[in-house]
Interface confidence: low
């Protein structure tokens, strides 16, 4: 229904705390360089204005759209051009073009320092002094670094953060209580970020239809007892929620997500028997819980998929009458039978089925033509299954760090033109798939591995779009979203690449590396490994292992030496010489 004042409506629906959090996220995701204090001031002004509209919906400007109100606020910031350059040109446009312009200027890789966690004592002091400001800083810092983070989910992580601090700051040993818990939240939030970015990419590049197909497959796997009409309704609602969040309409997105959670909990009987535990929780936890609820038990007596989609005499008639509905039911029926497949694989199968019907229904004898379609799915299914087996075997053999290194070598060979920091980030993220997925039961591995890899590769594509350097990467990133992972997997050594000349300074290290945290040490070593591959793209695994072992030994020796600086300056050049010889 239409409301006289949109801002009053959202303030009333969401309540002050969530309203303020979402407005802060929105501003931080649009203007990523502004300080917390600048944004906090704007948020307070917007909140005060919303309250006047709640009191009197007919008050001046209360009837304006949220985009107009927020955009006017952002455009009133002093020194906008100095700080943001051409983003300031957005302010010369009218809505809706102005908001589109802001969206186009979101930076997926802003030049901000990594978000450093203060030490426990300091964190607890500032949390106790002002929990609201402390959590505001958290929202601001995460949102500006992740401009497409799913806003209602970020509120959930802030709530988790809050609960952890409340608990751990009361303990004697704050550090050992906080560190593992906050590391866990950080890891989950980072995965959430890349997954959501993938959804927004799908929406931006291929439109709502593509996202809705993804949602139908995912929901059908999770709720195999829900009928097609129910799945379609949920997919439509979920598409709307994600479209709003990806489009910067965060208040509407959070409000509609709460509505969807409410609907699901009121209609459990026709959706799934697994929802009750989620539905007993408060709002943010409930919506989060529903988004990752375990799959319902599959109905025992589902007929073979062939009956309706291959053997039925009316296949071409049904397809011609309502293509999208027919393909939607195929995707639904196939997905509910295969919780063990990735959504990407299910979408590839649906695409294959569609292409087969397009071709066969134009022929003289369609059933003879499409009769083998299910058999033709086999290679499409085997490929990711083999990928999972090979990679999980490798992970189990090498461990996470070794597995990351293997991936780093592989991807540097595929796309040596890509910057070393991007390759290292991608390989470290891709390598985490082992820890995340390979330990799961067999039937959960494929969906976990492939859908996670797809999300990470989406980030590779986004970073590459900014500075396209590799034809290989451009080729894989230009195709459809679901074909990307197979495309990257199929890439081999880039034969067009002219190897980098050997620069001794790239492999020169100093004693400061000894005091770095383990993660930073790994990144330094992985940077050297990528540079080695760029120098010798066709180096064998054995050669690279020899060099890296030597390098690890050198670091170990010099970091234990009494005079570290002398060790690094004398042994370093010897290491460089040995590396050159080993790779000759």
């Amino acid at each position: 229904e239409a409301h006289k004042s949109e801002i009053a409506h959202r303030y009333n629906d969401l309540g002050e705390q969530h309203f303020k959090g979402l407005v802060l996220i929105a501003f931080s995701q649009y203007l990523q360089k502004c300080s917390y204090d600048e944004h906090a001031k704007l948020v307070q002004e917007v909140t005060d204005f919303a309250k006047t509209c709640v009191a009197d919906e007919s008050a001046a400007n209360c009837d304006k759209s949220l985009h107009t109100l927020f955009g006017d606020k952002l455009c009133a910031i002093p020194n906008l051009r100095e700080n943001y350059g051409e983003l300031a040109d957005c302010c010369t446009k009218q809505e809706p073009e102005r908001n589109e312009c802001f969206l186009q200027h979101k930076d997926d890789n802003p030049s901000l320092p990594p978000f450093e966690r203060p030490e426990a004592e300091a964190m607890c002091t500032s949390f106790k002094e002002n929990p609201t400001t402390f959590m505001g800083h958290y929202l601001h810092e995460v949102a500006r670094r992740h401009p497409y983070f799913y806003a209602p989910e970020l509120l959930y992580y802030a709530e988790q953060y809050n609960e952890i601090l409340t608990q751990c700051c009361a303990e004697a040993d704050k550090e050992s209580c906080l560190t593992p818990k906050l590391d866990g939240v950080k890891e989950k939030a980072l995965v959430s970020s890349v997954r959501q970015r993938m959804k927004c990419s799908s929406m931006q590049k291929f439109g709502e239809r593509a996202f809705k197909a993804w949602a139908v497959a995912r929901l059908s796997q999770t709720f195999p007892n829900a009928d097609f009409a129910e799945i379609t309704k949920l997919a439509t609602d979920l598409t709307k929620v994600n479209k709003e969040c990806c489009h910067g309409d965060l208040l509407e997105c959070a409000d509609d997500r709460a509505e969807l959670a409410k609907y699901m909990c009121e209609n459990q009987a026709t959706i799934s028997s697994k929802l009750q535990t989620c539905c007993d929780k408060p709002l943010l936890k409930k919506a989060h819980c529903l988004s990752e609820v375990e799959h319902d038990t599959m109905p025992a007596d589902l007929p073979a998929i062939a009956a309706d989609f291959v053997e039925d005499q009316e296949v071409c008639k049904n397809y011609a009458e309502a293509k999208d509905v027919f393909l939607g039911t195929f995707l639904y029926e196939y997905s509910r039978r295969h919780p063990d497949y990735s959504v990407s694989l299910l979408l590839r199968l649906a695409k294959k089925y569609e292409a087969t019907l397009e071709k066969c229904c134009a022929e003289a004898n369609p059933p003879a033509c499409y009769g083998t379609v299910l058999a033709e799915f086999q290679p499409l299914v085997e490929e990711p299954k083999n990928l999972v087996k090979t990679n999980c075997d490798l992970y189990e053999k090498l461990g996470e760090y070794g597995f990351q290194n293997a991936i780093l070598v592989r991807y540097t060979q595929k796309a040596p033109q890509v910057s070393t920091p991007t390759l290292v980030e991608a390989a470290r993220n891709l390598g985490r798939v082992g820890t995340k997925c390979c330990t799961l039961p067999e039937d959960q591995r494929l969906p976990c591995v492939e859908d996670y890899l797809s999300a990470i590769l989406n980030r590779v594509c986004l970073l590459h779009e900014k500075t396209p350097v590799s034809e290989h990467v451009t080729k894989c990133c230009s195709g459809s979203l679901v074909e990307r992972r197979p495309c990257f997997s199929a890439l081999t050594v880039d034969e067009t690449y002219v190897p980098k000349e050997f620069k001794a300074e790239t492999f020169t290290f100093h004693s400061d590396i000894c005091t770095l945290p383990e993660k930073e040490k790994q990144i330094k070593k992985q940077t050297a490994l990528a540079e080695l591959v760029k120098h010798k793209p066709k180096a064998t695994a054995e050669q690279l292992k020899t060099v890296m072992d030597d390098f690890a030994q050198f670091l170990d020796t010099c970091c234990k030496a009494a005079d570290k600086d002398t060790c690094f300056s004398t042994e370093g050049p010897n290491l460089v010489t040995r590396c050159k010889d080993a790779l000759a």
């Epitope: 195999p224 007892n225 829900a226 009928d227 009409a229 129910e230 309704k233 209609n267 459990q268 009987a269 026709t270 959706i271 799934s272 028997s273 009750q276 038990t297 109905p299 025992a300 007596d301 589902l302 007929p303």
Partner: nanobody, 114 residues
């Protein structure tokens, strides 16, 4: 082809009881949540009750809570609605539907009147 047939409706006095039955065929009944919906004269459709595929989860509209009981027999492909303490406002055509779908059957008339 999916078919649902309701029976068991009739005329009953306020405070009386009825048991509605829905017979299903043409689909894997045991795989689907089912609902009862009703339409009073001149009104829109109103959801009454729902039950999950395995009967583990049952839901009721506030207006019928404590008076109506939904149940099913998957082996017989039957859905039931036990209605007690009937009131005049329960007068309507009752339909069984798959999930939360729209009625695709004739329904059965329930009239509560003295």
């Amino acid at each position: 082809q999916v078919q649902l047939a309701e029976s068991g409706g009739g005329l009953v006095q306020p405070g009386g009881s009825l048991r509605l039955t829905c017979t299903a065929s043409g689909f894997t009944f045991g795989s689907f949540g089912m609902s009862w919906v009703r339409q009073a004269p001149g009104e829109g459709l109103e959801w009454v009750s729902a039950i999950s595929a395995d009967s583990s989860d049952k839901r009721y509209a506030d207006s019928v809570k404590g008076r109506f009981t939904i149940s099913r027999d998957n082996a017989k492909k039957m859905l039931y609605l036990e209605m007690n303490s009937l009131k005049s406002e329960d007068t309507a055509v009752y339909y069984c539907v798959i999930g939360r779908g729209s009625p695709a059957s004739q329904g059965t008339q329930v009239t509560v009147s003295s």
